[in-house]
């Protein structure tokens, strides 16, 4: 008799999830000498322990603490790039500007990027059929709690000038409900962070508006200022040229506004 199982609204665990996490861990530790000491089988043990046999709407940050401990990593605190709704460009940027880091350039972010996972209460099975959706089912699901936990820690570690890449094509350039707006902004440490610099990425070729004047950016500025952190904003009118100029800063066309 097939056992009844909870049907959630979101997609199920990414297929071959354990193998993917393990393979990514091995690859990451091979590429990053400072993380060579990490035992990937222990990392997976800590990961599985965070969500397997637990109700997928009852996950806490505490559940991820063993994983956080194993994945502890020091990145240069003044080289942090946050992003909101523009992940691909942020990652393209740090692939070129190798001394800057997004969360997904750290071990834990790299392990989980683009993956979905959940378990079932009281069974040692992974649920490959469905997982809770943040809106339709519950917010304390394994994936959301993971990203909230690692994002908070990443923001807490930042210092000096912190950069954030924002998507100027969206109706809310700064969204208070995004991970950046709800977690990272509130966990920047004013005693360590001097300035938050926003890079607003334009989508249209002929878009010459100053998106730094957008009401949502003003809202971000207000939140940041109230936290005793300075705020600055730059328009990136041509993201393609921006990336090209990061690759080849000597190019003559890179002296004009990007």
């Amino acid at each position: 008799v097939p056992r009844w199982r909870q049907q959630w609204s979101g997609p199920g665990t990414t297929k071959r999830f354990p193998e993917t996490v393990l393979a990514r861990c091995v690859k990451y530790t091979e590429i990053h000498p400072e993380m060579r000491h990490v035992d990937c089988q222990s990392v997976w043990d800590a990961f599985k322990g965070a969500f397997i046999s637990k109700h997928p709407c009852n996950i806490t940050e505490e559940d991820y603490q063993p994983l956080m401990k194993l994945g502890t990593q020091t990145v240069p605190c003044n080289k942090i790039l946050l992003w909101s709704r523009i992940k691909d460009l942020a990652h393209q940027f740090t692939q070129v500007q190798r001394d800057m880091f997004t969360l997904e350039d750290t071990l834990l972010g790299y392990l989980a990027d683009d993956l979905t996972w959940c378990g079932e209460f009281n069974t040692s099975k992974i649920n490959y059929q469905s997982c809770p959706d943040w809106r339709k089912d519950c917010s304390n699901n394994p994936v959301s709690v993971f990203w909230k936990t690692v994002s908070r820690r990443f923001a807490e570690a930042a210092c000096d000038v912190v950069h954030v890449m924002l998507n100027g094509s969206r109706s809310k350039i700064f969204d208070k409900n995004s991970t950046f707006g709800s977690v990272e902004v509130h966990n920047l440490q004013p005693e360590k962070v001097q300035t938050l610099e926003a890079w607003v990425i334009h989508g249209g070729r002929e878009d010459s508006r100053d998106l730094c004047q957008d009401p949502t950016i003003k809202e971000l500025e207000s939140i940041i200022s109230k936290r005793n952190i300075q705020f600055s904003c730059k328009n990136i009118y041509r993201p393609d040229k921006f990336l090209q100029c990061v690759k080849n800063p000597e190019d003559s066309s890179c002296t004009s506004e990007i």
């Epitope: 043990d45 599985k48 046999s53």
Partner: antibody, heavy 120, light 107 residues
């Protein structure tokens, strides 16, 4: 059905090395992990280490680090355990045991065991 | 390392008896616990995993319970073929560790 067949008994001198093999059949070799567990005469079970063939990576108990090498050959579906600098206390039956890569279950299949005797 | 402590180390019982073996972990291991049976000169055999799930093909007289640090293996009605040594093992973290074993002998 699944079978793990280990190599035969060995008699070794102190200071030498031993390499025990474990050939798997009846399952997809690369879908599993293989651990080595030893049992000294009249004693309990002691986990030594584990290899994941599809990744080619292994880990081991701190007690054995530097002395044990655990490997796997996907082409022959065989896991190996190499123990060096042998001493008399290493006299034991060595078992290979299989579990799933995700380590969500127990060691569900075991080899028949290989007796390694270390004696001068 | 997580220490696994079994009790008793040995017990004598008769066919038909209800037998209980306990296993305590030195720190919480959730339900990542397995029980094995080993007979002389044989490899161990898996009985229970995830603290309470019966391995396929294992008679229903075997059952497991517990979570966190305290676990129990129960044989509801001991059969002649059950006289053996039983081991618990945690697979919560590395290194994997076993209890020292409980020998079940004929009274």
């Amino acid at each position: 059905q699944v079978q793990l067949v280990q190599s035969g008994a060995e008699v070794k001198k102190p200071g030498s090395s031993v390499k025990v093999s474990c050939k798997a059949s009846g399952g997809t070799f690369s879908s599993y992990a293989f651990s080595w567990v030893r049992q000294a005469p009249g004693q309990g079970l002691e986990w030594m280490g584990r290899v994941i063939p599809f990744l080619g990576t292994a880990n081991s108990a701190q007690k054995f680090q530097g002395r044990v090498t655990i490997t796997a050959d996907k082409s022959t579906s065989t896991a190996y355990m190499d123990l060096s600098s042998l001493r008399s206390e290493d006299t034991a039956v060595y078992y290979c045991a299989r579990d799933d890569i995700a380590a969500l279950g127990p060691f569900d299949y075991w080899g028949q065991g290989t007796l390694v005797t270390v004696s001068s | 390392d997580i220490q696994m402590t079994q009790s008793p180390s040995s017990l004598s019982a008769s066919v038909g008896d209800r037998v209980t073996i306990t296993c305590r972990a030195s720190q919480g291991i959730s339900s990542w616990l397995a029980w094995y049976q080993q007979k002389p000169e044989k490899a161990p055999k898996s009985l229970i995993y995830a603290a309470s799930s019966l391995q396929s093909g294992v008679p229903s007289r075997f059952s497991g319970s517990g979570s966190g640090t305290d676990f129990t293996l129960t044989i509801s009605s001991l059969q002649p073929e059950d006289f053996a040594t039983y081991y618990c093992q945690q697979y919560n973290s590395y290194p994997r560790t076993f209890g020292q074993g409980t020998k079940v002998e004929i009274k």
